[in-house]
């Protein structure tokens, strides 16, 4: 038997993936656990094996279909259960009625690229990945730029309050190496959270021309 407090948190990527993390204070001795997803009106269900990510937490990804297929909508409720093997049978360790579009976390933006770079500015574009058509333009972005001698945590956040998949960074220092990251969030959903940060994009501003400032 397992005692202790348990936390079970899941997010829907808006297309075909539900990612879950289960934390349990009490020790689990080499027990096999899984997450089972049972939609309220769909003719499919799905299971994933929970794998340890720390001493007392486990994670797994429910792959519901092809990455860009719309497997759930705003009308769906999915019963999510954590099941752990106890002898010959499975014991329900945690359960929640999951509303996918109230618990969104999109995939990190991809395909970051420098469109145009100058001495003091840089235009960068990106794409969103596996985002539902339901959002239309109802997305927002946060971006940050890593300057030399600073950490990501120190980088000021730039907020784009609309679906804008580019940014023009200004007031940069000439001939300097920077890194840039962006993340995305739908406006919909009570428990919706930011996507992970994108992979950093490294770029270098152009050196200042001798004798004049560009």
């Amino acid at each position: 038997a397992v005692n202790g407090t348990s936390q079970f948190t899941c997010f829907y990527n808006s297309r075909a993936n539900i990612s879950c993390v289960w934390s349990q204070d009490g020790a689990l001795q080499d027990t096999s656990c899984q997450v089972h997803a049972w939609p309220d009106r769909r003719r499919w269900n799905q299971t994933c094996e929970l794998l340890p990510v720390s001493q007392a937490s486990w994670a797994c990804n429910l792959i519901l279909g092809a990455p860009d297929s719309q497997k759930l909508t705003t009308v769906d409720i999915v019963t999510l259960r954590v099941l752990c093997r106890e002898g010959v049978r499975w014991r329900v360790m945690a359960i929640q009625d999951f509303k996918p579009f109230e618990n969104l976390r999109l995939m990190a933006p991809i395909s970051l690229q420098v469109v145009h770079v100058e001495t003091h500015r840089c235009n960068i574009s990106w794409e969103i990945s596996q985002a539902s058509h339901y959002f239309e333009r109802h997305l927002e972005f946060e971006a940050r730029t890593l300057s030399p001698g600073h950490t990501w945590e120190e980088a000021p956040l730039l907020t784009l309050k609309q679906k804008q998949e580019w940014i023009c960074l200004e007031t940069l220092t000439p001939d300097t190496q920077y890194e840039f990251q962006v993340r995305v969030k739908p406006l919909q959903g009570e428990f919706t959270t930011w996507s992970p940060w994108s992979q950093p994009l490294a770029f270098r501003t152009k050196p200042a021309a001798l004798g004049k400032d560009t």
């Epitope: 309220d40 009106r41 297929s69 719309q70 909508t73």
Partner: antibody
Framework: QVQLVQSGAEVKKPGASVKVSCKAS????????IEWVRQAPGQGLEWMGE????????NHNEKFQGRVTMTRDTSTSTVYMELSSLRSEDTAVYYC?????????WGQGTTVTVSS | DIQMTQSPSSLSASVGDRVTITCKAS??????VAWYQQKPGKAPKSLIY???YRYSGVPSRFSGSGSGTDFTLTISSLQPEDFATYFC?????????FGQGTKLEIK
């Protein structure tokens, strides 16, 4: 096998209410949404709303908001749909149907005639 | 509300014919589309869900396809019992809505 059996035909006067029943059998009653769909004579299908018997959760078509009431009795595996303030345009066949994949099993229909 | 526009509204065909009915959604509905068959005085019968999945017991001559806004129901070789009215439906978002129907008649 899955079956949805509805109550018999009704004749009502304008302004009255009608309550149609739908008794389910052959599956776990609490687990699946029951939908209500109506069809006026010679017309298409119109979704009215749905109820999840296990929790009692309800979603309505806003067109019927305030006039339609959906309830369930888990002891008899029966769902009810009551439509109030009836008018002549509510004359239709009313169907209950289970939502699993889409609307997979249908009741036989209940004819409601609204006439003065 | 999402409008489902079916075409044609009526169709005359012969036994053995291949018939295609189309349905256009006013917004993207993914693959959350179903097809139903209805005969006079009877309740609708489910044929297809999720745009292309046949319910068990539905003959293989019935097939569905499409995603986004454009959907089709195809009957590969019409049988006498297939003459009926066919409805498409979206269940992607509330309120769920149906097409106006396609009446398939014997030529």
């Amino acid at each position: 096998q899955v079956q949805l059996v509805q109550s018999g035909a009704e004749v009502k006067k304008p302004g009255a209410s009608v309550k149609v029943s739908c008794k389910a059998s052959g599956y776990t009653f609490s687990r699946y949404w029951i939908e209500w769909v109506r069809q006026a004579p010679g017309q298409g299908l119109e979704w009215m709303g749905e109820i999840l018997p296990g929790s009692g959760s309800i979603n309505h078509n806003e067109k019927f908001q305030g006039r339609v009431t959906m309830t369930r009795d888990t002891s008899t595996s029966t769902v009810y749909m009551e439509l109030s303030s009836l008018r002549s345009e509510d004359t239709a066949v009313y169907y209950c149907t289970r939502h699993y994949g889409s609307f997979d099993y249908w009741g036989q229909g209940t004819t409601v005639t609204v006439s003065s | 509300d999402i409008q489902m526009t079916q075409s044609p509204s009526s169709l005359s065909a012969s036994v053995g014919d291949r018939v295609t009915i189309t349905c256009k959604a006013s917004q993207n509905v993914g693959t959350d589309v179903a097809w139903y068959q209805q005969k006079p005085g009877k309740a609708p019968k489910s044929l297809i869900y999720s745009a292309s999945y046949r319910y068990s017991g539905v003959p293989s001559r019935f097939s569905g396809s499409g995603s986004g806004t454009d959907f089709t129901l195809t009957i590969s070789s019409l049988q006498p019992e297939d003459f009926a009215t066919y409805f498409c439906q979206q269940y992607s978002s509330y309120p769920f809505t149906f097409g106006q129907g396609t009446k398939l008649e014997i030529k």
